[in-house]
Amino acid sequence: LQDLCSNCPAGTFCDNNRSQICSPCPPNSFSSAGGQRTCDICRQCKGVFKTRKECSSTSNAECDCISGYHCLGAECSMCEQDCKQGQELTKKGCKDCCFGTFNDQKRGICRPWTNCSLDGKSVLVNGTKERDVVCGPSPADLSPGASSATPPAPAREPGHSPQ
């Protein structure tokens, strides 16, 4: 009896109600391997999802997200609402990044600005809600009287390592 079922190809199931005949999967279902006793349910790409690949008798549907949403997970198992740059998604919707944090994407969370001083550098360009700070050379790198707005020095030649 087991051998009869193993002969059923993908796209069919082994129907116990009909003496283990191989029956086609019913509408909106599929079997991706042979020898199945039941067909899997097709995924429906509705609501915030849109169809990227239709369900067939041998493979499940694949979904993308509609405009204004982005996929979570490699298989787009969920859709999450987009926010603007400078915002993050909370349970109450999109919220502006708090002072000292930024988000340069439509997804994800606000991240703290880089602390330039930890690397012994100074802030060259202040951070915003949308952009991280830009760290410049360390104060010691600046010649006396040079302002922090001085453009970066050209690349040094070999042998001229900084002091």
Partner: antibody, heavy 119, light 112 residues
């Protein structure tokens, strides 16, 4: 293709227990959510939690189960349900089930494993 | 939270008769509804998915209908083997952490 639950036992109130759902004849792929459902003796079915066994690993819980129950994918063929601070109200047969639709429709179920919480 | 209300709790039918079971969702769930049959000592068996699609191997005497909040399972030409408890289940994964899924309370079908 089949699912089999194991780990059910008689435990005392306050104890913890881990149940395992093992797949045979297939491996957990990106198509599937694996979920746990329980049924107290003589009562109806109650959904507990689901995990997406594709790469995203999303997990979702019934509101009453959050914090005390943890669903995890532990291999390509096993999913576990960790339960803590068990009470007599958790006495039930625990089923694991498979969903390919993303809408809580289970076409494949295990036979269930009995958890009894009693002093 | 999504609540599924199933009626009646019990129904009796003669062989060859018709049984109708109703299920009401507390909010619009489109057609994201399944019906299961469960016999004592066994796990549930999927009968209907997406409110009206017949699962593989399920006899055509089982018919599901409805959408939104009102759903019905009809068993025509009832057979002795149909004696069981039937459950509806509605649910969907939302795009946030708020996830909804629920079973109805069940309907026992007695076949005379």
């Amino acid at each position: 293709q089949s699912l089999e639950e194991s780990g059910g036992d008689l435990v005392k109130p306050g104890a913890s227990l881990t149940l395992t759902c093992t797949a045979s004849g297939f491996s957990f792929s990106s198509n599937y959510w694996i979920c746990w459902v329980r049924q107290a003796p003589g009562k109806g079915l109650e959904w507990i939690a689901c995990i997406y066994v594709g790469s995203s690993g999303d997990t979702y819980y019934a509101s009453w189960a959050k914090g005390r129950f943890t669903i995890s994918k532990t291999s390509s063929t096993t999913v576990t349900l960790q339960m803590t601070s068990l009470t007599a109200a958790d006495t039930a047969t625990y089923f694991c089930a498979r969903d390919s639709s993303s809408y809580y429709m289970f076409n494949l179920w295990g036979q269930g494993t009995l958890v009894t919480v009693s002093s | 939270a999504l609540v599924m209300t199933q009626t009646p709790a019990s129904v009796s039918a003669a062989v060859g008769g018709t049984v109708t079971i109703n299920c009401q969702a507390s909010e619009d769930i489109d057609t994201y509804l399944a019906w299961y049959q469960q016999k004592p000592g066994q796990p549930p068996k999927l009968l209907i998915f997406y409110a009206s699609d017949l699962a593989s191997g399920v006899p055509s005497r089982f018919k599901g209908s409805g959408s939104g909040t009102e759903f019905t399972l009809t068993i025509s030409g009832v057979q002795c083997d149909d004696a069981a408890t039937y459950y509806c289940q509605g649910g969907y994964y939302t795009s946030s952490a708020d996830t909804r899924g629920a079973f109805g309370g069940g309907t026992e079908v007695v076949v005379k």
